[in-house]
């Protein structure tokens, strides 16, 4: 009985959110001995790589030198060992950012709150979009989607010290084309009256030269980074 190989792991470096005209690399990690990797974009074959020597390589990279809205969308990859093909990878949502305008992000009742207070973020963009995304920086990044004609509300509810951190928002023109990021808003949450200790913020990667909302991928952190991507992409679908 013909079997399939385990699905490969797909991610984007340095990040799945790519400013237009910047470069991005799509990585596909399969097995040693794979003779061919195929990258599919929106269901169609997009690129092929045949690693040499296959027994020494378990990962290939597909380089996109100039990101634009035509390159934004859903990618997946498969690989082949001999005649046997793998299951397709999970879908990677590649997003082009820095399209058109910059939203403004604000927080109610203010950027410094007490644990238990009800906090709401507001993301506003006056151009034609009705979908907004709120992102919290950090390895365990949270992405929320909101809707509104020119503004979306993101109620966090009663916050805890785990909500501390830096937030940005984007306007979304479609699932894969986002605006410039808003200016960051840093939310400070102090403990309640019984517990005044402050929880540490989520660990964040060092900022790269494209702006701090992009996360760099460091050796040994690729899997974490890809999981970060995967978390965010689940919200896109």
């Amino acid at each position: 009985q013909q079997q399939t190989l385990p699905k490969p792991f797909i991610w984007a470096e340095p990040h799945f959110m790519v400013p237009k005209e910047k470069q991005v690399t799509i990585c596909c990690q399969g097995n040693y001995g794979a003779v061919e990797y195929q990258l599919h974009f929106e269901g169609s074959l997009f690129a092929v790589d045949r690693p040499k020597p296959p027994e020494r390589i378990n990962k290939v990279k597909f380089y996109i030198p100039d990101m634009n809205s035509r390159m934004a969308g859903q990618y997946s990859c498969i690989y082949r060992v001999g005649e046997l093909w793998s299951e397709p990878s999970n879908l990677l949502d590649l997003v082009v950012t820095e399209m058109y305008d910059t939203p403004t992000l604000s927080v109610h009742p203010g950027p410094e709150v007490i644990s238990g207070e009800k906090v709401t973020f507001y993301c506003r963009l006056d151009t034609a979009t009705s979908m907004f995304l709120l992102l919290k920086e950090g390895r365990s990044s949270h992405v929320q989607r909101g809707y509104g004609k020119v503004q979306a509300e993101f109620p966090l509810g009663p916050v805890t010290t785990a909500h501390r951190g830096t937030y940005r928002c984007f306007g979304s023109y479609n699932n894969h084309a986002w605006s410039f990021p808003s200016e960051p808003v840093k939310l400070l949450v102090t403990g309640d009256i019984e517990n005044t200790s402050l929880a540490p913020e989520d660990p964040t990667f060092p900022a790269d030269t494209w702006g701090t909302y992009l996360l760099t991928t460091e050796t040994g952190l690729q899997k974490d980074h890809a999981l970060w991507d995967h978390t965010a992409q689940n919200l896109l679908r």
Partner: antibody, heavy 117, light 107 residues
Amino acid sequence: QVQLQQPGAELVRPGASVRLSCKASGYTFTTYWMHWVKLRPGQGFEWIGEINPGNGGTNYNEKFKRKATLTVDKSSSTAYMQLSSLTSEDSAVYYCAIRLRFALDYWGQGTSVTVSS
Amino acid sequence: DIQMTQTTSSLSASLGDRVTISCRASQDVRNFLNWFQQKPDGTVKLLIYFTSRLHSGVPSRFSGSGSGTDYSLTISNLEQEDIATYFCQQGNTLPPTFGGGTKLEIK
């Protein structure tokens, strides 16, 4: 240091409108919501509403929705409150205030509005 | 809206006295209770936030306590400069609401 400057007094006719100002300095104007509060002698404070100077978003006390309109001018770091169709019930001291940390921690000096013919 | 009640509208005390001003909410405000001081010239200052936390620059003779619906402000050693009207305010739900005020006078 943080300052919220308000004019001392306004005398207006019944049925008219008045625009009160609050000039802010000493902090990032667009980051913090500006609140407006009414104080009538012997009646305690009433919260009128708040405006986000960064994007113009507002929250109003239902009681003042038809009475007050909040706006800002970012270029001059000034918040405004327009009160319309004034009656003697609107005679009061009106304060602007901001919450920099955990409560309304900075207040203007208040503008005394007298509605009289 | 949450109603805030300060049953004592005025209070006379001597310098050096310990004075307690109370405030009751119509429903639980989860400790999001603040106290303000309004001086005779109209100046308003925050004294206490989140029931018991002293705002920066406020003398330590001021303290706050309470939970649920019942809260109080205490001035442990009354001074001349404390002559003012004191207001409680809940910040648990919109709209924020204030008590009617307690006017403190010297005997």
